[in-house]
């Protein structure tokens, strides 16, 4: 055909997969009547009639485009729906009158690939390999046309480098016509690459312009020989008895060598292997002062059988020994003096203080507590606290009970108890003294004694309320070798109008408890035994 060589370049129409391509027939009125047009697709230089326009009416030809073509824009534009990669070809429209002319359109199809999927080589890479080893694989699925891949290390693009970096890319065509790209990065790595971040980037084009997608960043296991092993202790800082202490071996190689932790025997000066947990960590829980000493770590490379030894590390578990108070169980006469001395050993400087157990009041700062002109009230608990001020929480204490010789001291002198006749009464009476007193009652009933502490006793009596009992009341008498003392319980009948906070009735059986609400007080009186008494 004359003048075929000067054919103009086809008009470019760009569209994404799945969308609609609008193919506008660019014939001018002079070149042909648009009401009489044939549309062709050109594939491998073979043209196939796909659509014809007659008197402005369109008709698809049977074949692959039959269902996807329609006429728009008063017959000037052919719309192709559901574009696929296979639609990337030349379309042409041909006018029949006044003479045969044609207009060519190049359809370009695009599809963004999915997010690139990066997989690191799980086996890792030794640093001393002779040639590049597989670092990671990048896969970009379902893109069109084939995207470009760029590999990055620590944010910098990698280029092919002989014997150092090799990028091996391949692609497959899916049944959809889309491409899946696979790119393998091979490289020779060095020890410093153990923390290197690798990722791949896919570059692709869309009708809107150039785009890119990045994979996540990955690190690759890099294997390199151990040059140094060392010990690490947690927690850092001052350790104390009772702490959970972890001693672990660390090495600068990967994989780490087989570790063993040894402690120097202070007697033999020889290293003795300690038992570690499954992670190779020596856990001291609770840490004791005996754990103090010199520790070292041995790392054995099981491939080369090369053994490395760490620098020894001194571990100090600070402690306070058991606190000793002397005398341990002091007994003193009223009016006498007592010196309590507190002793303890520690790995650090100690501070001592004495507290009154009952009140928590600090009596003395220092190891020695001097008590003068002892009164009965001075009896009871004194606590020595030995602490290490530089290590919070490191302290030990010892309680000492000071016993002041004396006849029994009653918790109350007398008390009124509200009762009902025929009720079973539960009475209690408390006395203290040294030696510890015994308690007796002046009425028959079921009595039981409970020792409250070394100098204090509580007696409980269950007794039936009778008219005689109401008249006489109840007495409890506490006695020891130094004297005796009595408490009186007055029984008063409850009538319905009387409020009775001390008694409660349950299923017809009433129980009343008369027991001291406070520690012994000064209302009690002491009576020396009127005459010597023999008891078995």
């Amino acid at each position: 055909v004359p003048g075929e060589a000067e054919q103009p370049a086809p008009e470019l129409v760009e569209v994404e997969v799945g969308s609609t391509a609008l193919l506008k027939c660019g014939l001018s009125q002079s070149q042909g009547n648009l009401s009489h047009v044939d549309w062709f697709s050109v594939h491998k230089e073979k043209r196939t009639l796909i659509f014809r326009v007659r008197q402005g009416q369109g008709q698809s030809e049977p074949g692959e485009y039959e269902q996807r073509l329609s006429l728009q824009d008063r017959g000037a534009t052919l719309a192709l729906t559901q574009v696929t990669p296979q639609d990337e070809r030349i379309f042409l429209c041909q006018g029949k009158r006044p003479r045969s002319q044609e207009y060519r359109i190049q359809l370009r199809v695009y599809k963004a690939p999915e997010e690139p999927n990066i997989q690191v080589n799980p086996l890792g890479i030794p640093v001393n390999s002779k040639e590049p080893e597989e670092v990671a694989t990048c896969v970009g699925r379902n893109g069109y046309p084939i995207p470009q891949v760029i590999w990055y290390k620590n944010g910098r693009p990698l280029k092919e480098e002989k014997n150092r970096v090799h990028i091996q890319s391949s692609q497959t065509v899916e049944s959809s016509g889309l491409y899946t790209l696979q790119s393998i990065l091979k490289a020779q790595l060095v020890k410093e690459d153990k923390d290197a971040q690798f990722y791949c980037e896919l570059n692709y084009r869309l009708p809107s312009g150039n785009h890119m997608k990045e994979s996540r960043e990955v690190t690759v296991p890099v294997f390199y020989p151990t040059e140094k092993v060392w010990l690490e202790v947690e927690p850092v800082g001052m350790l104390k008895e009772g702490d959970r202490v972890e001693i672990r071996c660390l090495a600068d190689g990967n994989p780490p060598p087989h570790f063993s932790i040894s402690k120097q025997n202070p007697s033999t000066r020889e290293a003795e292997e300690e038992t570690t947990n499954d992670n190779g960590v020596l856990v001291l829980e609770p840490a004791r002062k005996e754990h103090s000493g010199r520790y070292e770590c041995q790392g054995l490379d099981l491939d080369t059988m090369i053994s490395l030894l760490s620098e020894p590390q001194e571990l100090l578990v600070n402690y306070v020994s058991d606190v000793r108070v002397s005398p341990a169980a002091p007994e003193r006469q009223e009016g006498s003096s007592l010196t309590l001395t507190c002793e303890a050993e520690s790995s650090q400087d100690l501070e001592f203080q004495w507290l009154r157990e009952e009140t928590g009041q600090v009596l003395e700062r220092g190891p020695v507590l001097q008590l003068h002109d002892l009164k009965r009230e001075a009896g009871g608990g004194y606590r020595c606290v030995a602490s290490v001020p530089s290590i919070p929480g490191l302290n030990r204490t010892q309680l000492v009970n000071v016993a002041i010789f004396g006849p029994p001291w009653m918790a109350f002198k007398e008390r009124k108890v509200w009762v009902k006749e025929n009720m079973v009464l539960n009475l209690s009476c408390e006395a203290s003294g040294h030696p510890r007193p015994t308690i007796s009652w002046n009425v028959n009933g079921t009595a039981s004694e409970q020792d409250q502490d070394p100098q204090r006793v509580l007696s409980t009596l269950n007794v039936l309320v009778t008219p005689e009992l109401l008249e006489t009341g109840v007495e409890c008498t506490a006695s020891n070798d130094l004297g005796k003392n009595t408490s009186i319980l007055f029984l008063e009948l409850v009538n319905l109008t009387t409020l009775t906070p001390d008694s409660n009735t349950t299923t017809g059986l009433s129980t009343s408890t008369a027991s001291p609400h406070t520690r012994a007080n000064s209302t009690s009186t002491e009576r020396k035994l009127p005459e010597p008494e023999s008891r078995g």
């Epitope: 309680l399 009970n401 010789f405 040294h434 502490d453 070798d481 010597p532 008494e533 023999s534």
Partner: antibody, heavy 118, light 111 residues
Framework: QVQLVESGGGVVQPGRSLRLSCAAS????????IHWVRQAPGKGLEWVAR????????YYNEKFKGKFTLSVDNSKNTLYLQMNSLRAEDTAVYYC???????????WGAGTMVTVSS | DIQMTQSPSSLSASVGDRVTITCRAS??????????MHWYQQKPGKAPKLLIY???NLESGVPSRFSGSGSGTDFTLTISSLQPEDFATYYC?????????FGQGTKLEIK
Amino acid sequence: QVQLVESGGGVVQPGRSLRLSCAASGFTFSNYWIHWVRQAPGKGLEWVARIYPGTDITYYNEKFKGKFTLSVDNSKNTLYLQMNSLRAEDTAVYYCARSGGYWYFDVWGAGTMVTVSS
Amino acid sequence: DIQMTQSPSSLSASVGDRVTITCRASKSVSISGYSYMHWYQQKPGKAPKLLIYLASNLESGVPSRFSGSGSGTDFTLTISSLQPEDFATYYCQHSRELPYTFGQGTKLEIK
């Protein structure tokens, strides 16, 4: 120094009586309890009785009640154990010992041997 | 009466050994933190000597190799490193109530 010294032991015929003495020195006699503990030859220790010199209160092992009697002479700081109706099984070393109100014996005399034999 | 049972009745050991003697009471001899159990050493022809009082307190002048422990009904006297002068008979005694009773004794002999 703190000391307890027993005396009065010896050989005595069955059914007879004997009085043992325990002299105390070096401490305030009336502030402590004095006990008698005996030990038969080759046997263990057996607590007999106690007295508190400050009040003269005595306690006895039930086994010796009515047979042994404790007394005290505060002016002499001396304790006595009167033993009646002695039998062969009363043959023992008799010790006096001191205690406080927790009843452990921190000071002991050297003991005096009583042999009941016909 | 509270019965005191010592074990063993006799024991052979060597100088430097660690020795443990136990004493079991037929009922508890402890009151709120205080255990009324005491230990004595007796050598032939001599009076007993107090070693440990109230279960764990070392009597003044007694070497620190002696220690006591326990509460309730079970108590232990330990000699950490036996010395030649420690070969003797050892007794436990309770003072929880009357009558006070002693264990039958443990004779510690040289092996």
